[in-house]
Interface confidence: low
């Protein structure tokens, strides 16, 4: 007897991090034998949506014309073939930015830092939030994720980097969020350019992936080193 049907592949275009109001397409790719595709959204009635396959039947398109809070969440897809339903795909986490006002990102003591020294990136929100994310442009997403302990809300989070190397140089943004839905993020902060001078190391590795793309298994987040910040936030490496 044949084993279970192979699980489909689920992804989003242009990526899994979408700003409010923008369109996004969710794709589910199964096999040529697929007769129907089904998309489930966590904590929503199931099936969340169903679509007939597009020729040559090995994938289906689920369109979201305008991103709102409704659509943020965790998805899985399935396909039905003549022998039954497939295993679920790996989950896709669709994140919406623009749910809250943008935080402010600054560098202490300065965004111009000498290699080997320390710098702390400070993300500050106007209203208290309990989750902060630091993103480095053209790096895996998210770069750093700080969540407050015991649900305590903070106006800021510290991201210390020590010792700084040339790898830390680049453009950063931060987001704030509430822990009860990490699928809803604030508008991004204005970009902060961290410039590392006096480096004796070789050139920085060339970037390979943009922030808006869902990180694949080959992506290795670039993680600043350093002690756990003392802002009441627990560090989560993801």
């Amino acid at each position: 007897q044949a084993g279970p049907l192979p699980k489909p592949t689920l992804w989003a275009e242009p990526g899994s991090v979408i700003s409010w109001g923008n369109s996004v397409t969710i794709w589910c790719q199964g096999t040529l034998e697929a007769r129907e595709y089904r998309l489930d959204k966590e904590e929503s009635p199931a099936p969340w949506d169903r679509q007939n396959p597009l020729e040559p039947k090995n994938k289906a398109r689920f369109s979201i014309p305008s991103m709102t809070e409704d659509y943020a969440g965790r998805y899985r897809c399935y396909y039905r073939s003549p022998v039954g339903w497939s295993q679920p795909s790996d989950p896709l986490e669709l994140v919406m930015t623009g749910a809250y006002s943008k935080p402010t990102l600054s560098a202490l003591p300065s965004p111009l830092v000498t290699s080997g020294k320390s710098v702390t990136l400070l993300c500050q929100s106007r209203s208290p939030m309990d989750t902060f994310l630091l993103i480095k442009e053209r790096a895996a997403h998210p770069l750093l994720h700080l969540r407050s302990e015991h649900g305590a809300q903070q106006h800021q989070a510290e991201f210390p980097m020590s010792p700084v190397t040339s790898v830390h140089g680049g453009t950063y943004r931060c987001f704030s969020s509430h822990g009860f839905s990490h699928y809803l993020l604030s508008h991004p902060s204005d970009p902060l350019e961290l410039i590392v001078s006096g480096s004796l190391e070789g050139p920085r590795p060339s970037p390979t992936r943009s922030v808006s793309t869902a990180a694949g298994p080959e992506d290795q987040p670039l993680m600043p080193t350093g002690s756990v910040p003392h802002s009441g936030l627990r560090r989560h490496w993801e």
């Epitope: 959204k41 904590e43 929503s44 709102t68 809070e69 409704d70 809803l184």
Partner: antibody
């Protein structure tokens, strides 16, 4: 079958805060928008604001400075607080759920019975 | 903010008449429009949403049309139980503004 029930005082004094709670029964509060709407005597419907189950909110600009909508997922409830009320806030207050089906969201398909709030000294 | 304007504000028609209520948005709202019926002393009921999709259990004499800025609710053959105030509402983005309502009476 999802049902909504508003609760709170029927009489509020001017300048005080109006507080109402909507209890969701027969279903989960998760993954829906939950709204408050009001209707002054003899007048039309006015959208007050919504809260998503995650806590994200959006308010009617004309009420924003006085309005707070919150959610308690553990109790399957969401609440409205309107501060500094005047006689103009006298109305029937409804809670409602924004509808959903197969990947699409639409108008408010489930409503509470409404609760009359009078602002008077 | 986008304004929603309904017309007429009231109308009187005979049983069996074809009745049309219009709703105009001050900006394009695609088809993110809902129509509600509120009978006297009752809770509003969702009839149509999005603009042309009849909700389950709503009689087929009701229909909706339009997209962008101009929308229409039509009752093909007016019945006595259709006496109510009808509201349109946009929901493409907040605020989810209602029209001012159209009061429908039987002649």
């Amino acid at each position: 079958q999802v049902q909504l029930q508003e609760s709170g005082p029927g009489l509020v004094k001017p300048s005080e805060t109006l507080s109402l709670t909507c209890t969701v029964s027969g279903g989960s509060i998760s993954s829906y928008y939950w709204s408050w709407i009001r209707q002054p005597p003899g007048k039309g419907l006015e959208w007050i604001g919504y809260i998503y189950y995650s806590g994200s909110t959006n308010y009617n600009p004309s009420l924003k400075s006085r309005l707070t909508i919150s959610v308690d997922t553990s109790k399957n409830q969401f609440s409205l607080k309107l501060s500094s009320v005047t006689a103009a806030d006298t109305a029937v207050y409804y809670c409602a759920r924004r509808g959903y089906s197969y990947g699409y969201y639409y108008g408010m398909d489930v409503w509470g019975q409404g609760t009359t709030v009078t602002v008077s000294s | 903010d986008i304004q929603m304007t309904q017309s007429p504000s009231s109308l009187s028609a005979s049983v069996g008449d074809r009745v049309t209520i219009t709703c105009r948005a001050s900006q394009d709202i695609s088809n993110y429009l809902a129509w509600y019926q509120q009978k006297p002393g009752k809770v509003p009921k969702l009839l149509i949403s999005p603009a042309s999709t009849l909700q389950s259990g709503v009689p087929s004499r009701f229909s909706g049309s339009g997209s962008g800025t101009d929308f229409t609710l039509t009752i093909s053959s007016l019945q006595p139980e259709d006496v109510a105030t009808y509201y349109c509402q946009k929901y493409n983005s907040a605020p989810w503004t209602f029209g001012q309502g159209t009061k429908l009476e039987i002649k």
